[in-house]
Structures are given as structure tokens and as C-alpha cells.
């Protein structure tokens, strides 16, 4: 297992919510991405391929998410101060083998200006 801080901007704020960006290498074809808050699994997304190169996307812990060819974005809405925490992208790579797990993360700071429904 490889652990480390994200070397990219992991948190993108908009409209009282946050997009948490979890990147993976372009070469990865089949994987599971979990978003962890502390040690708790908040969201997950698994991408696998069929014999005809059809793709299956599954979530056991569903969050609004967006998949690209090198990242999964998880969206958290209605931010409040309780969202401030360490968040981790837990990537399990199935294909290409061999199986490996990488963990990258960062701290989500919540500032007044980022909170939902602020009275201006």
C-alpha cells in the first residue's frame, strides 16, 4: 500500500459544496475508488470491464460522482463545519495487474465563505 498527500488540488469548492478529486493513472482499466473521511467509507465507485470491453460502474456506498479517464470526482453538498476532516482517496487497482492499493489524501478546511447558505 502506498500512502501520501495528494500532489494536486484535491478540493474544489462551489455553491456551498465541494468536489473531491481522486486521480488515478491513465493506464488503469479496472479499479475501485473509495472516498474515506477519517477511517469511514463515505463513497465508492468500482469500474470493471466485460469481455466485449463493455464497462460496468457500480457503487455500494453511493455519492454523486463523476468518472473521467484519469479521475473520479465525489461531490459533497451542504457543507458545514463538521465536514472539516482528513479525506482520503483509496484506490484499488485490478487492471493492469498485479493488484495494488494506493492511499492519497488531504485536510479539508472549511471557511465561512465556503459554507452553504451564508447570509451575505
Amino acid at each position: 500500500e502506498i500512502n501520501g498527500s495528494a500532489n494536486y488540488e484535491m478540493f474544489i469548492f462551489h455553491n456551498g459544496g465541494v468536489q473531491i478529486l481522486c486521480k488515478y493513472p491513465d493506464i488503469v482499466q479496472q479499479f475501485k475508488m473509495q472516498l474515506l473521511k477519517g477511517g469511514q467509507i463515505l463513497c465508492d465507485l468500482t469500474k470493471t470491464k466485460g469481455s466485449g470491453n463493455t464497462v460496468s460502474i457500480k457503487s455500494l456506498k453511493f455519492c454523486h460522482s463523476q468518472l473521467s479517464n484519469n479521475s473520479v470526482s465525489f461531490f459533497l453538498y451542504n457543507l458545514d463545519r463538521s465536514h472539516a476532516n482528513y479525506y482520503f482517496c483509496n484506490l484499488s487497482i485490478f487492471d493492469p495487474p498485479p493488484f495494488k492499493v494506493t492511499l492519497t489524501g488531504g485536510y479539508l478546511h472549511i471557511y465561512e465563505s465556503q459554507l452553504c447558505c451564508q447570509l451575505k
Partner: antibody, heavy 121, light 106 residues
Framework: EVQLVESGGGLVKPGGSLRLSCAAS????????MHWVRQAPGKGLEWVGV??????????YYSDLVKGRFTISRDDSKNTLYLQMNSLKTEDTAVYYC????????????WGQGTLVTVSS | DIQMTQSPSSLSASVGDRVTITCQAS??????LSWYQQKPGKAPKLLIY???LLAEGVPSRFSGSGSGTDFTFTISSLQPEDIATYYC????????FGPGTKVDIK
């Protein structure tokens, strides 16, 4: 212990039909892509076709040599794979193997011992 | 459809010899190539997958290399129990086997 046991082989006339079965045990059958592979006497291995898992809507794919004549199906509740062979030709004579493969999260590959199909008049 | 060719079709070598088999795909298959061993009257056995990864329980004298269209399978020191036919198989797009290489002892 993983086991794949093929049955249903035998002698059939050209133009006839036969249904092969493959009973699986010792692994989670529903998670595996299931293939049929055949081997004519004294020849090499030839892929026949595959049926994917429920996640992929049990999609089936076939080699050009059998497309339109052979049909693969599966019954996950019975851990059984089937090969329905119609319009059989003498060149379909072979040992038919069922094989199970998975790539997620680790790569596994299991084979049965095969069942002989002879197409002859 | 992806075609696979293999060479040689047969070879004889002495115990302890290094044996090399080559496999060529008709188009780029990345590293989605397996090698199988088949002994007479038996089902094939997976030795190597994803070009160079050893299947569970396979001795380290077996190895594989290559990428794209050209691949190599090597037995570093041939043993009597290695007498068999060896097949490459692409799994980039469905499955296709090579024609096989029969290996025996001199």
C-alpha cells in the same frame, strides 16, 4: 476445491444438435466469466465463446466459426454453464472444455477436464 | 479478429537447457497475453498472465516478456516434467490462442 465438470458429449450426426453442461463448484460461479474452448483431435486450442456475468447483462460473444449455430447460457442459481450446439459439422469434432476466468481483484483461471463431441455419419 | 502466431512449432532440448518460444499478435494487445502448458490428455494449465506475471504455484523457471505485438516465453532450465505443448493466448479482445509449440527432451 475448485471443480468444473463437463458432460453431454457424445456421437452425433452432421446437422444434429447437442447440449453440453458444465457444473461448477468451489468458487463463486456468478462472479466469473465462463468460456468454452475446444480442441480437435491432435490439434491446438480454439476459443468458442464466452458469457459474461450479471453485471454485464450476461452478454455472450462467439468465434466466427460457431456464430449463429452455438449458444452459451448459464444458470447462476445452479452453478452451471451450458453450450447448445446446433447444425453440427464434422469439423466441430473436438474435446470441449469449459473455463472460468476473473480479473478482479486477482486473476484466476480454472479449466474442466473436457468432454468429447464426435460429429460423424 | 486478432490472430496469434507462434514459433517454433516444435523443439527438442536437453534437460537444463534454456528454452525460448516466441508469440506474435496481428495487432497491438498491450500486455494482455497468457501462456498455457498442456500435457497429453490433460486440460491446459495457466502459467503466466499479463505477459510476465506467474500464476499461483508456477515455478520461477518460467518467465515471459514483451509488449504490443511481440512476446517471448522462456524456461530457464528445462526439466523432464516440462515436456508439454505451450500455447500463447491473447485476451485483449475476447480470446485467441496461438497454434502451440511442442517441447520434448533430446
Amino acid at each position: 476445491e475448485v471443480q468444473l465438470v463437463e458432460s453431454g458429449g457424445g456421437l452425433v450426426k452432421p446437422g444434429g444438435s447437442l447440449r453440453l453442461s458444465c457444473a461448477a463448484s468451489g468458487f463463486t460461479f456468478s462472479d466469473y466469466f465462463m468460456h468454452w474452448v475446444r480442441q480437435a483431435p491432435g490439434k491446438g486450442l480454439e476459443w468458442v465463446g464466452v458469457i459474461d456475468t450479471k453485471s454485464f447483462n450476461y452478454a455472450t460473444y462467439y468465434s466466427d466459426l460457431v456464430k449463429g449455430r452455438f449458444t452459451i447460457s448459464r444458470d447462476d442459481s445452479k452453478n452451471t454453464l451450458y453450450l447448445q450446439m446446433n447444425s453440427l459439422k464434422t469439423e466441430d469434432t473436438a474435446v470441449y472444455y469449459c473455463t472460468a476466468t476473473i480479473a478482479v481483484p486477482y486473476y484466476f483461471d480454472y479449466w474442466g477436464q473436457g468432454t468429447l463431441v464426435t460429429v460423424s455419419s | 479478429d486478432i490472430q496469434m502466431t507462434q514459433s517454433p512449432s516444435s523443439l527438442s532440448a536437453s534437460v537444463g537447457d534454456r528454452v525460448t518460444i516466441t508469440c506474435q499478435a496481428s495487432q497491438d494487445i498491450s500486455n494482455y497475453l497468457s501462456w498455457y502448458q498442456q500435457k497429453p490428455g490433460k486440460a491446459p494449465k495457466l502459467l503466466i498472465y499479463y505477459t510476465n506475471l506467474l500464476a499461483e504455484g508456477v515455478p520461477s523457471r518460467f518467465s515471459g516478456s514483451g509488449s504490443g505485438t511481440d512476446f517471448t516465453f522462456t524456461i530457464s532450465s528445462l526439466q523432464p516434467e516440462d515436456i508439454a505443448t505451450y500455447y500463447c493466448q491473447q485476451y485483449y479482445n475476447y480470446r485467441t490462442f496461438g497454434p502451440g509449440t511442442k517441447v520434448d527432451i533430446k
